[in-house]
Interface confidence: low
């Protein structure tokens, strides 16, 4: 950066050179350069030469003023018209930030993704800081009372086999920059109240042509908890508003959960589960799309790898879309 | 300018107490927890623990949670840590410092308190 | 608690030569983001001075003469060239976890 230059002279900040966005500031510059009574002393903010607002303090400094100073980052340097020199002489340059001191970090959750082998905590930043801003996970054993801390610009992920205290914590999140420092609420939690089942996904959809024709959603899960409660949430693709089934769910076989649906329309399906009684859910699963078929299925054409066909009987989807906007990975 | 002011040398018998100070000037005293170090003559460093101002939340080295009591005092920026049944292994200079940014290293020191036990 | 094992002891040093100083880790101290290892230079009667954080970054205001590096267990400080100014005592320190704990120091000296 502009920092690493040499110097024949010096560059100040006042109140410093990270600030509260929207204060007045002032930048000294003072030469120092052998032979030279400076002129005129000029300032110049990424590159460009400023025009207004600077005072001559003496003979060797100068300052420059401004008020509501906005910009996140701002290189600066100095340079000094010296008698019987052509060109400026460059005094020093500094690098300057604003941005606002952190808010109390909110909304802390802290959640085991079964397999995962680690705890992810997350929570509300606040505002945006504009500056480096660090965040410090405390976690306080309730039974030993020995505290880790973890450092990390955003999110964490803590190994579950550092969590060696026992199974109730607090948790709490610090937030740092060179403005200010908050502390969240205590966040008290207990392990095996945090564990969200393997990621339910469904695999497939077949429509059967009875009486009233059926469609069978196939999904499954790898997880090994024994009591999981699921939601699979289905609408029309023309529908604003989703139609959720419950399910008490035990994934020791794959699941089949029967639709009666209108025919000929463009179905999308997702799913999630929790451990039963349990306070986190899964993040909703990739969007599934399926249409069904008009009252008397014509000819069925074949998606992806799917070899088990009622020929004429059946119409299957294997098909899964990208994340939209009502698809949102929330927990809660 | 971030200044670590500590109080001075202390002689104490074996069994007192002892209580250091350590007055902060130059940023905002409740925004940065306080860490206390410990030098004993000739050895390396100890981490005693820490305070952090707002709350009044500390945090001990297992070491030193029987015997070191860490406090504030927010209305002069000042930070104590007393130390009880005070023994000759006390003996040590004690160090307030402060990070930076939290956890990226004691950019600030106190000068130093020596404590010396002794009959 | 971590324990930071710090070699040599001491060590002397022909003025402009490369002076190396090793910290072990008893475990990780690291993640992708962040080696949670800082260096100290300490002179006699003054307060321990920082001089690398998280391993290799610099701390404002110290000679490019001092360098950090290393990941996960190992970790190392170069000085190079060594000064005259540069005789003191080095320390490694963790802030992996509570408690954060210091390496045993290496006494430089410059022949």
């Known amino acids: 950066g502009i920092t690493n230059i040499n110097c024949s002279g010096h560059i100040w900040v006042e109140p410093a050179t990270i600030f509260k966005m929207g204060m007045n500031i002032s930048i000294y510059c003072q030469a120092a350069i052998k032979n030279c009574q400076p002129r005129k002393l000029h300032f110049y903010k990424n590159g460009i030469k400023e025009r207004f607002q600077i005072t001559r303090i003496n003979k060797t400094t100068a300052r420059l003023w401004y008020k509501n100073f906005l910009e996140p980052h701002a290189s600066m340097y100095c340079t000094a018209e010296c008698p019987k020199h052509f060109q400026e002489t460059l005094i020093c340059g500094k690098d300057i930030s604003s941005g606002y001191p952190p808010d109390i970090p909110d909304e802390v959750t802290c959640v085991i993704y079964e397999y995962s082998g680690n705890m992810t905590c997350t929570w509300n930043a606040g505002k945006l800081t504009y500056i480096d801003t660090k965040y410090v996970v405390h976690v306080k054993s309730l039974e030993t009372e020995e505290e880790q801390q973890y450092l990390t610009s955003s999110y964490i992920n803590i190994s579950t086999d550092s969590l060696q205290g026992g199974k109730k914590y607090l948790v709490w999140v610090q937030a740092a920059n060179a403005l200010g420092m908050e502390e969240s609420k205590q966040l008290q939690i207990h392990l095996d109240d945090i564990v969200i089942p393997s990621a339910a996904v469904i695999s497939r959809a077949e429509t059967i042509n009875a009486t009233v024709p059926k469609t069978i959603i196939y999904w499954d899960s790898q997880t090994t908890i024994e009591k999981v409660s699921c939601e699979m949430r289905y609408k029309a693709t023309t529908n604003q508003t989703w139609n959720v089934k419950e399910f008490d769910t035990n994934f020791t076989y794959v699941q089949q959960s029967e639709f009666y649906l209108e025919p000929n329309i463009k179905y999308v399906f997702q799913v999630r589960c929790q451990e039963t009684g349990k306070r986190y859910w899964q993040p909703w699963s990739s969007l599934f799309f399926h249409k069904t078929p008009e009252t008397v299925p014509q000819v069925t054409s074949k998606a992806f790898q799917h070899d088990t066909w009622n020929s004429g009987l059946t119409v299957a989807s294997i098909s899964t879309g990208h994340l939209t906007s009502d698809n949102r990975g929330d927990i809660g | 300018e971030v200044q670590l002011q500590q109080s001075g040398p202390e002689l104490v018998k074996p069994g007192a107490s002892v209580k250091i100070s350590c007055k902060a000037s130059g940023y905002t005293f409740t925004d940065h927890t306080m860490d206390w170090v410990k030098q004993s003559h000739g050895k390396s460093l100890e981490w005693i623990g820490y305070?952090?101002?707002?709350?009044?939340?500390?945090a001990y080295s297992q070491k030193f949670k029987s015997e070191a009591t860490l406090t504030v005092d927010k209305s002069s920026s000042t930070a104590y840590m007393e130390f009880h049944s005070l023994t000759s292994e006390d003996s040590a200079v004690y160090y307030c410092?402060?990070?930076?940014?939290?956890?990226?290293?004691?950019?600030?020191w106190g000068q130093g308190t020596s404590v010396t036990v002794s009959s | 608690q971590i324990v930071l094992t710090q070699s040599p002891a001491s060590l002397a040093v022909s003025l402009g030569q490369r002076a190396t100083i090793s910290c072990r880790a008893s475990?990780?101290?690291?993640?992708?983001?962040?080696?949670?290892i800082h260096w100290y230079q300490q002179k006699p009667g003054q307060p321990p001075k920082l001089l690398i954080k998280?391993?290799?970054n610099l701390e404002s205001g110290v000679p490019a003469r001092f360098s950090g590096s290393g990941s996960g267990t190992d970790f190392t400080l170069n000085i190079h060239p060594v000064e005259e100014d540069d005789t003191a005592t080095y320390y490694c320190?963790?802030?992996?976890?509570?408690?954060?704990?210091f390496g045993s120091g290496t006494k430089l000296e410059i022949k």
């Open positions: 410092a402060r990070w930076g940014l939290r956890r990226d290293g004691f950019t600030y």
């Open positions: 320190q963790h802030t992996w976890e509570i408690p954060y704990t």
């Open positions: 305070i952090y101002p707002k709350s009044g939340n500390a």
């Open positions: 998280y391993a290799s």
């Open positions: 475990q990780s101290v690291s993640t992708s983001s962040y080696n949670y």
